[in-house]
């Protein structure tokens, strides 16, 4: 539960996160498990600890081993382990299984390949992508944020895809590569103009001040795996991330494929500790794909605490 496998290539950056739950204010100490020797926090060191993160800049084969992180809260010390393996770079093109991240699959309509572990790094776009060691070129391939999009996927697109990016630490640059397999599903599907199943247009959602509230934006986009379909929430016409209210966050729900084959997406808007001012906002559920955009608007109203009849509409 609290031991995590991590791997990387020599002379590349590797960043590992302690697998224990903690708060940013907690102190985290890192040790070499075998020697119990403390890992320094000074950034001038090639291997150093930075809170929840252990950084190898760059990694060496000799760094392989088990590292202990101790998360120190005011009440407890909790221990986690990072099992790190650093491999020599292969001279040939073949990427061995032990360097592969989880396989992803796509289809003609949906072909996103995410670059594994990239969220741990300080990187800037664009990513470089390779298939079977060849740089991907041509208009069918688009590097977008932390993923690769392949247009008009064919079965020949299956293979091993490597993303390459630069991690920047205090002005120094380090290369990182990560590889995963991509398989292609043969799927006869279609896409439609988005259909929002929830919320209803102009729905009034009853909430209790001081409680948590969830709003779910749910939309279907057609049959089979969809290409470039998204659901999201806006507050007063502004993206959640730009609105700047930490109590209000959106969280991706499950990708759903119903028995009738419809492909649907959910986005849950979580409002912590509902406040009076939240009732003044306009909440827009947006569903968009290649056909266009559909919007349903929700407003919040104060629920009478002694009105039990509608309590089943309210989730934490």
């Amino acid at each position: 539960k609290f031991s995590k496998q991590s791997w990387g290539l020599e002379n590349e950056a590797l960043i590992v996160r302690c697998p224990r739950q903690g708060k940013p204010s907690y102190t985290v100490d890192w040790y070499y498990s075998q020697t119990n020797k403390s890992i320094p926090t000074q950034e001038r060191n090639r291997v150093f600890a930075s809170g929840q993160l252990l950084k190898f800049l760059p990694a060496a084969v000799a760094d392989s081993g088990i590292y202990t992180c101790i998360v120190r809260s005011p009440t407890f010390n909790r221990t986690g382990y990072a099992n790190v393996t650093i491999y020599k770079k292969q001279s040939d093109c073949n990427v061995p299984d032990y360097l592969m991240y989880s396989t992803v699959s796509g289809s003609e309509k949906n072909s996103k390949i995410y670059c594994p572990t990239i969220d741990l790094y300080n990187w800037t776009a664009p990513l470089e992508w390779f298939k079977n060691c060849q740089a991907l070129q041509g208009s069918r391939y688009r590097a977008h944020k932390s993923f690769l999009v392949i247009d008009n996927v064919m079965t020949e697109d299956a293979g091993d895809y490597t993303c390459k990016f630069i991690h920047n630490e205090n002005g120094a640059n380090y290369s990182v590569t990560a590889t995963r397999s991509f398989t292609v599903k043969d799927e006869q599907g279609f896409s439609l103009f988005p259909v929002i199943g929830a919320p209803a247009q102009n729905e009034i959602k009853e909430v209790e001040i001081g409680k948590n509230a969830n709003l779910t934006c749910s939309a279907c986009f057609g049959k089979g795996t969809q290409f470039l379909a998204a659901v999201l929430w806006q507050l007063n016409g502004t993206k959640i991330t730009d609105f700047g209210e930490p109590r209000i966050q959106q969280e991706e729900g499950q990708n759903q494929s119903f028995s009738n084959g419809l492909a649907c997406l959910d986005m849950v808007l979580r409002i912590a500790d509902v406040k009076e001012e939240d009732l003044l906002l306009q909440y827009d559920c947006l569903a968009l794909n290649l056909h266009g955009l559909r919007r349903h608007t929700v407003r919040l109203s104060r629920k009478n605490p002694i009105d039990h009849h509608s309590h089943h509409h309210h989730h934490h």
Partner: antibody, heavy 117, light 106 residues
């Protein structure tokens, strides 16, 4: 020495709500998590949930999702538990307890809540 | 949801005897289990934290062992002051207490 001060007892009518308080001394509640635990007469302990007072994030045991609301006021170093739509099933001692994400280290003396008409 | 089955519900021992309490979880939780003692009219007190770690000030006659799904709490040479209810707590997934064990003296 860390101490958690809770009011001793509350007598409330069925259907009403009650808000319990827990004030910490010699400890800044925003530095850790506050848990709430229920204990019915002659029964075992039930975990209600935990709050991260620094940011207000809460997590509830499924059973208490619609019953309990945890809040915290870091300026007064106080955590609160509000219980709504009270019934005789809610008659219990309610403990606040400081700890990390995984367990509780320091406990209050408990507030006895009696629901009776 | 992780559930915890604690046994026995109660037991009666003579002073100096050994006490063994067991908790079984329905999923593998490594060693993320804690043991609490609750004396009458008092709040619970943490005796042993995860990884079988004795809390500061807790006598060494208390110990625990186990990993995965099966956990045991032991009191060697029980004293009269050990009369209390004992609870295990799993914190792998949410938090769940065992039903408790009432320890009495013969």
């Amino acid at each position: 020495e860390v101490q958690l001060q809770q009011s001793v007892a509350e007598l409330v009518r069925p259907g009403a709500s009650v808000k319990l308080s827990c004030t910490a001394s010699a400890f800044n509640i925003k530095d850790d998590y506050m848990h709430w635990v229920k204990q019915r007469p002659e029964q075992g302990l039930e975990w209600i949930g935990r709050i991260d007072p620094a940011i207000g994030n809460t997590e509830y045991a499924p059973k208490f999702q619609d019953k309990a609301t945890m809040t915290a006021d870091t300026s007064s170093n106080t955590a609160y538990l509000q219980l709504s739509s009270l019934t005789s099933e809610d008659t219990a001692v309610y403990y606040c307890a400081l700890g990390d994400f995984y367990a509780m280290a320091y406990w209050g003396q408990g507030t006895s809540v009696t629901v009776s008409s | 949801e992780t559930t915890v089955t604690q046994s026995p519900a109660s037991l009666s021992v003579a002073t100096g005897e050994k006490v063994t309490i067991r908790c079984i979880t329905n999923t593998d939780i490594d060693d993320v289990i804690h043991w609490y003692q609750q004396k009458p009219g008092e709040p619970p007190k943490l005796l042993i934290s995860e990884g079988n770690t004795l809390r500061p000030g807790v006598p060494s006659r208390f110990s625990s062992s186990g990993y995965g799904t099966d956990f045991v709490f032991t009191i060697e040479n029980t004293l009269s002051e050990d009369v209390a209810d004992y609870y295990c707590l799993q914190s792998d997934n949410m938090l769940t207490f065992g039903a408790g064990t009432k320890l009495e003296l013969k």
